[in-house]
């Protein structure tokens, strides 16, 4: 069972001093987000017993394995059901405490009732403040039964539940009709899933015979020991004031466990600590009684004395629960109450015994749960004891359960049962997860879900190149940390598998499923530099770069050009997908913008070092287009152009540029400057006769503007072939701007 205890402080004179504490003795309990242990939860459960809302209760965590609930302001805050939840996974367990108001009309004679399947349970509510009206019994908040007030027997209302079954478990209450629910007597009924002394599916297995009021768990056959007792069968008493499965916890305060109610996992329920009794656990046991709720009687023989915490204290020469066994009777010594082995191991189990006559090898035997008897293979004889060693055949899961070491001599016999837990080594159900990769390393999360039993003591990561027959490389890692596999080959697939181990010999599980993880390409190492750049328009930039010469093939797939517009906080990226390219035209840029420019080589997804940056200023965009361009032939070699100035000019025009092209011709156009910006007409001379020409023009301020519409016009016929078109007021060699 899970080592979980819910303590209620029952010193009820002041509700504000009342507290509930949940203590877990489980390894790693309460660490919260830790994958190996969910947190302890402690809360009031208002589903069945609803109380008026009050200020919220305060929850305080004390270390990783303890949580305390305080902040009760009035007695009614205390009434009802509280629960603590602890343990991980399939071991998650809820411990329940039911609190009754000491001033209620009806009080339970006993709050927790643990009964076996098929038993008759009797709940008894004692009249504390009489009302001459019906008593309503409820089960888990729903109507269950009615008693007339005349039906009280010796001042008690009894509810008989014959032939109880596990679904009958729950919270029962007895309430007078018309009375406040807070005046009810609240009970908790726990019905074990099996008949007395049985456990397991089908209730076929025999309980170990729990001592000192321990209760056999119907699922796993373990004894849930009362507070203050320990051992597989609760055979050992803790020191006064201690509790927990290994007596590892100490009761708070100077008066030890006085005034504390202890609630343990079902099917135990709640009781006072060892040595105490009464509704508030403040009364010491009467002489001759001991244990939780003082339910046990000593009946010591042979001069033994009764200790209210531990039972009979035997004089020299006697032992046994009632000091009924002479020390001459053989006795099993120091047998561990619980042993754990891994599946398919062949452990050695030792069993020591003393007595008179002295036990010999053949007088000590080991009995497995299936009844098989093992004889010892060797014995070590010492003056005060004989230790028999048993070689156990390969363990199977069915070997889990209660084993027994038995010694028999002519002086009598003794036996000691102990629990053997056969654990299944853990096997990963999934492959490890790749977190990040580089060219020579992989970062892997090895923590995966697994079948079998924890805790995980070590994690081994096995890896080797895919399709390789070489030996696996192995790295041993901490279960909760990510692993970096180093010194790998770039651009290589690796098969990676996890192997988990649990403590103990043979705790290594089978390897988990493989997964393929591929290292990245090698990083490109060459740093380009920018050779130059020039503006090809207000929004176009041609860039060229170089790489250092190195021997061997170039490691790279292409280049990445980056333009950073600091004013707008925008980055433009241009991918050049050939590693041989050394120039690129960047278009669609923003005129008048200051850019920072660099280039870097890339390989796969990895970027090499960036070139030293260059700073480039694109000219601002030019003025709008001239309007209403018109062409008129004047002669066989002259055409006059007329236009209107552009509208909404951002500044004074410095010149116009006219583009002249023969219609349908394949040659490049000619550009002619008109340097007098105030003009709205010009004559283009030196044209060929009978030839159709296309004209368009644009203005320039700091940069060239937009082109106007294109116009067509033909020169007149019969002229001589001209040398080429010129503008009226300039010589041709001055005006041409190819």
């Amino acid at each position: 069972a899970v080592d979980l205890t819910l303590l209620a402080n029952l010193r009820l004179t002041d509700p504000q001093r009342f507290f509930l504490t949940c203590v877990s003795g489980e390894a790693g309990a309460g660490r919260g987000s830790d994958a190996w242990g969910p947190p302890l939860l402690l809360e009031k459960d208002d589903r069945i017993v609803r109380t008026p809302p009050g200020p919220p209760l305060r929850l305080a965590r004390n270390g990783s394995h303890q949580v305390t609930l305080r902040g009760f302001s009035k007695p009614s805050d205390l009434v009802g059901v509280f629960s603590c939840v602890g343990g991980a996974g399939a071991r998650r367990t809820r411990v329940i405490y039911v609190h009754n108001s000491p001033g209620a009309h009806l009080l339970p004679d006993k709050v927790t009732h643990t009964v076996n399947k098929g038993d008759t349970a009797v709940l008894s509510a004692r009249v504390h403040k009489e009302k001459q009206t019906d008593v309503i019994w409820k089960s888990n908040g729903s109507y269950f039964y009615t008693l007339d007030w005349h039906e009280a027997q010796d001042g008690r209302f009894l509810l008989q539940l014959p032939n109880v079954q596990p679904p009958s478990s729950g919270i029962y209450s007895a309430t007078y009709l018309e009375a406040s629910p807070l005046g009810s007597a609240f009970f908790r009924l726990i019905v074990r899933g099996c008949g007395a002394g049985r456990w397991g599916p089908g209730c076929t297995k025999e309980c170990p015979g729990c001592l000192h009021g321990g209760v056999c768990h119907d699922h796993d056959g373990e004894c849930v020991c009362p507070p203050g007792f320990t051992g597989t069968r609760c055979e050992q008493a803790c020191r006064e004031g201690r509790f927990g499965q290994s007596c590892q916890e100490q009761c708070p305060g100077i008066s030890g466990c006085r005034g504390l109610t202890f609630c343990l996992p079902d099917p135990y329920g709640c009781s006072c600590g060892s040595g105490w009794r009464g509704s508030q656990c403040q009364e010491a046991c009467a002489p001759g009684h001991f244990g939780a709720d003082c339910r046990l009687q000593c009946q010591c023989q042979n001069g033994g004395t009764c200790d209210r915490f531990s039972g009979c204290v035997c004089p020299s020469g006697w032992h046994g629960v009632h000091c009924e066994k002479s020390d001459r009777i053989p006795q099993i010594l120091n047998m561990a109450s619980e042993l754990e082995f891994n599946l398919e191991t062949m452990p050695r189990i030792n069993c020591a015994a003393a007595g008179n006559p002295f036990p010999v090898r053949g007088s000590i035997e080991l009995r497995k749960p299936d009844g098989t008897v093992l004889l010892s293979t060797k014995a070590i004889v010492e003056p005060e004891k004989t230790t028999a060693e048993f070689e156990v055949p390969r363990l199977v899961l069915a070997d889990s359960g209660f084993w027994e070491c038995r010694v028999s001599t002519s002086g009598g016999q003794d036996s000691r049962r102990f629990k053997v837990n056969v654990k299944v080594p853990p096997v990963p159900l999934a492959a490890p997860r790749l977190l990040t990769k580089q060219s020579r390393q992989l970062v892997v999360s090895p923590l995966v879900s697994f079948s079998g039993d924890g805790p995980i003591s070590t994690v081994r990561l096995h890896y080797r190149p895919q399709d390789s027959t070489m030996d696996w490389s192995t790295i041993v890692v901490d279960p909760s940390e990510n692993v970096t596999l180093m010194n790998l080959r770039p651009k290589t697939g690796y098969s990676v598998r996890v192997q988990l181990s649990r403590p103990g010999e043979g705790g290594e599980g089978a390897w988990g499923p493989p997964t393929l993880m591929t290292t990245d390409c090698p990083e490109p190492l060459l740093q380009p530099w920018l050779e130059g750049w020039h503006v090809e328009g207000t929004d176009r930039l041609r860039v060229s770069w170089s790489l250092p010469l190195v021997p061997g093939p170039l490691v790279g797939d292409g280049f990445l050009l980056r333009l950073w517009d600091g004013t707008r906080g925008q980055e433009r990226r241009e991918n050049v997908s050939s590693p041989q390219a050394r120039t690129a035209l960047l278009t669609g840029l923003t005129p008048g913008t200051h850019y920072q420019l660099d280039v870097q080589l890339y390989h796969c997804t990895l970027l090499g070092p960036a070139s030293p940056p260059a700073h480039v200023l694109l000219p601002p965009s030019g003025p709008p287009a001239p309007r209403h361009l018109h062409a008129q032939a004047l002669s066989d070699s002259e055409i006059q152009l007329t236009w209107k100035h552009p509208e909404a000019l951002p500044g004074p025009i410095s010149k116009y540029v006219v583009e002249v092209q023969v219609a349908g011709g394949a040659g490049d156009p000619l550009w002619i400057d008109v340097d007098r910006p105030e003009e709205t007409s010009t004559i283009i001379r030196g044209l060929n006769a009978s030839t159709r020409y296309l004209f368009r023009m644009r203005a320039s301020i700091q940069g060239l503007g937009d082109w106007s519409n294109t116009v067509e016009e033909s020169t007149l016929g019969n002229g001589l072939q001209a040398e080429g078109p010129v503008q009226e007021s300039r010589a041709a060699e001055e005006g041409l701007d190819q």
């Epitope: 019906d134 309503i136 109507y143 269950f144 039964y145 009615t146 008693l147 007339d148 005349h150 039906e151 309430t175 009709l177 018309e178």
Partner: antibody, heavy 122, light 111 residues
Framework: EVQLLESGGGLVQPGGSLRLSCAAS????????MNWVRQAPGKGLEWVSV????????YYADSVKGRFTISRDNSKNTLYLQMNSLRAEDTAMYYC???????????????WGQGTLVTVSS | QSALTQPASVSGSPGQSITISCTGT?????????VSWYQQHPGKAPKLMIS???NRPSGVSNRFSGSKSGNTASLTISGLQAEDEADYYC???????????FGTGTKVTVL
């Protein structure tokens, strides 16, 4: 589904006896208080008697006290009303009714049978 | 224990609201919140309509509502419908040895 079925009614002479039965099904009969309620022809409802789940407590209307006896057999899920020294004014439809409880635990008659007619006449 | 007092009859037109009163003593209606109301159509068994003064069981129309003031409990039927025509009885838990007492009954007629 909760069902209550009365039987045993009929014509009886004044001073005679009759035993009514009520067979219950669809609920845990042994956990509930059970009642007999009667209604004379053209008149209102009159509560007659109640018996507690264990059978350990019974109560009667003044008009029938000493003449009628309510009982139950929890093993047979059956409620009974033994009527002795019958009078003409006992002529009525006799209903058996279960006491149920609301969320605030008030007792009321939540399920009724269809009734059995008792006629006391010479 | 005498019966609780109810009006012999109450009538109303469809869609109207009507209220039936039920007057008792401090030993019954006034002493407990345990008043219930039953509807009975001719030739049929009574049916629980209201419990605990104002608690409507599932399946009962929300046109039926109950209340209590002092020694008098009331049943209100709003939006009266033809199928509401029936006899209505109140009942109370009582402190006397009779435990339960019914009202004299009210015949509701839908005009």
């Amino acid at each position: 589904e909760v069902q209550l079925l009365e039987s045993g009614g009929g014509l009886v002479q004044p001073g005679g006896s009759l035993r009514l039965s009520c067979a219950a099904s669809g609920f845990t009969f042994s956990n509930y208080k059970m009642n007999w309620v009667r209604q004379a022809p053209g008149k209102g409802l009159e509560w007659v008697s109640v018996i507690y789940p264990s059978g350990g407590a019974t109560y009667y209307a003044d008009s029938v006290k000493g003449r009628f006896t309510i009982s139950r057999d929890n093993s047979k899920n059956t409620l009974y009303l033994q009527m002795n020294s019958l009078r003409a004014e006992d002529t009525a439809m006799y209903y058996c009714a279960r006491v149920g409880y609301s969320s605030s635990w008030d007792p009321h008659f939540d399920y009724w049978g269809q009734g059995t007619l008792v006629t006391v006449s010479s | 224990q005498s019966a609780l007092t109810q009006p012999a009859s109450v009538s109303g037109s469809p869609g109207q609201s009507i209220t039936i009163s039920c007057t008792g003593t401090s030993s019954d209606v006034g002493g407990y919140n345990y008043v219930s109301w039953y509807q009975q159509h001719p030739g049929k068994a009574p049916k629980l309509m209201i419990s605990d003064v104002s608690n409507r069981p599932s399946g009962v129309s929300n046109r039926f509502s109950g209340s209590k003031s002092g020694n008098t409990a009331s049943l209100t039927i709003s939006g009266l419908q033809a199928e509401d025509e029936a006899d209505y009885y109140c009942s109370s838990y009582t402190s006397s040895s009779t435990l339960y007492v019914f009202g004299t009954g009210t015949k509701v007629t839908v005009l």
